[in-house]
């Protein structure tokens, strides 16, 4: 495998890790997609200092990250523990909410415009952020 | 100059297989998803797959799902396409393509033809 | 999948000619399109990304609008060079797809 150790053109660089913020939107796992195809992922929020960084980066926009719990519980994308770990939701949230009327509930964390988070109808186009660290080894998967 | 340069393609018997190869010079492989886009005789693009810089990531269009694998060796600036149990459907001049996560094929190679036929 | 639906699939015109071709995608896309030109026996080349961003060294008279699920090629003023097959192609989602194409020739 290589090891990234700088950031990719566009990308910020901040304490060992890269951040790509989207200006378009689109659904969260066509965003998912496109971090993976990025050799990255949604971001993952795991300290009020990353969230603090984030939240400067995006503005008053919403904004997806890297949690779901569209298979039952909370998961981050990268296995980050959900329970122990950092979390900002608003009050009364995540309400997993049907009234929107469009099916289902509500199964993917968003950034709102004050920073805290919402669960939200993963179809919804919003802007997201990618997120890959750096020094980590990329793993190359052996030819068949 | 970019520079990608397909080859192994040919006639094959239908379920049978074959490897497609795609050579590449003149940018910074290993960072660069790339893809693969067909196109039949007469018809219009279908793009097939797409792989990630690492490798790490890879997508497919429904119809070769199971049966297609993209991979690359970035050591060697190359990309792969597998394909098994070929159909008459699969025929088609294969691209390969230097892509990005925005899906933007910004250059291409010059093709080859796959013929899968009795 | 998303399809995307070329109109018209053929135009004849003359150079000097402004040439409109239309894309619609079955379900919103923002502007997550790309316009290619293929010549015949040669592989496409990227002219327009995201909506209406025109790739380097296209030429001005190339200009790419729309949004959501309704977008437009347009060739201001038609040059021999021009004449080819225009195809658009959605990035908003697995599968990747393009539209059945529109063939610009010479009347």
């Known amino acids: 495998g290589s090891e990234r150790t700088c950031c990719p053109v566009n990308w910020v660089e901040h304490e060992r890790s890269c951040y790509w913020f989207s200006r378009s939107g689109k659904a969260w796992a066509d965003a998912d997609n496109y971090c993976r195809l990025e050799d990255a992922h949604l971001v993952v929020v795991t300290s009020w200092e990353e969230q603090k960084f984030v939240q400067h980066h995006i503005g008053p926009v919403n904004t997806w990250m890297g949690l779901h719990d569209q298979n039952g519980p909370w998961k981050w994308v990268d296995g980050t523990d959900y329970e122990t770990g950092f979390k900002n939701w608003r009050p009364e949230q995540p309400d997993d909410w049907y009234g929107h009327g469009l099916g289902g509930g509500e199964d993917c964390a968003h950034f709102t415009d004050d920073g805290r988070w919402n669960d939200d109808v993963c179809q919804r186009p919003y802007r997201w952020v990618c997120e890959t660290e750096l020094d980590k080894a990329s793993q190359e998967p052996p030819l068949l | 100059e970019v520079q990608l340069l397909e080859s192994g393609g040919g006639l094959v018997q239908p379920g049978g297989s074959l490897r497609l190869s795609c050579a590449a010079s003149?940018?910074?492989?290993?960072?660069?998803?790339m893809s693969w886009v067909r196109q039949a005789p007469g018809k219009g693009l279908e793009w097939v797959s797409v792989?990630?810089?690492?490798?790490?990531?890879?997508f497919y269009t429904d119809s070769v799902k199971g049966r297609f694998t993209i991979s690359r060796d970035n050591s060697k600036n190359t990309l792969y396409l597998q394909m098994n149990s070929l159909r008459a459907e699969d025929t088609a001049v294969y691209y390969c393509?230097?892509?990005?996560?925005?899906?933007?094929?910004?250059?291409w190679g010059q093709g080859t033809l796959v013929t899968v036929s009795s | 999948a998303i399809q995307m639906t070329q109109s018209p699939s053929s135009v004849s015109a003359s150079v000097g000619d402004r040439v409109t071709i239309t894309c619609r995608a079955s379900?919103?896309?923002?502007?997550?399109l790309a316009w290619y030109q293929q010549k015949p026996g040669k592989a496409p080349n990227l002219m327009i990304h995201?909506?209406?961003s025109l790739q380097g060294g296209v030429p001005s008279r190339f200009s790419g609008s729309g949004s959501g699920t309704d977008f437009t090629l347009t060739i201001s003023s038609l040059q021999p060079e021009d004449f080819a097959t225009y195809y658009c192609?959605?990035?908003?989602?697995?599968?990747?797809?393009f539209g059945q194409g529109t063939k610009v020739e010479i009347k």
């Open positions: 379900q919103g896309i923002s502007n997550w």
């Open positions: 393509a230097k892509s990005n996560s925005s899906g933007w094929f910004d250059y």
């Open positions: 995201a909506a209406f």
């Open positions: 003149g940018f910074t492989f290993r960072s660069s998803a």
């Open positions: 192609q959605q990035t908003n989602s697995f599968p990747w797809t």
């Open positions: 792989i990630s810089g690492s490798g790490g990531s890879t």
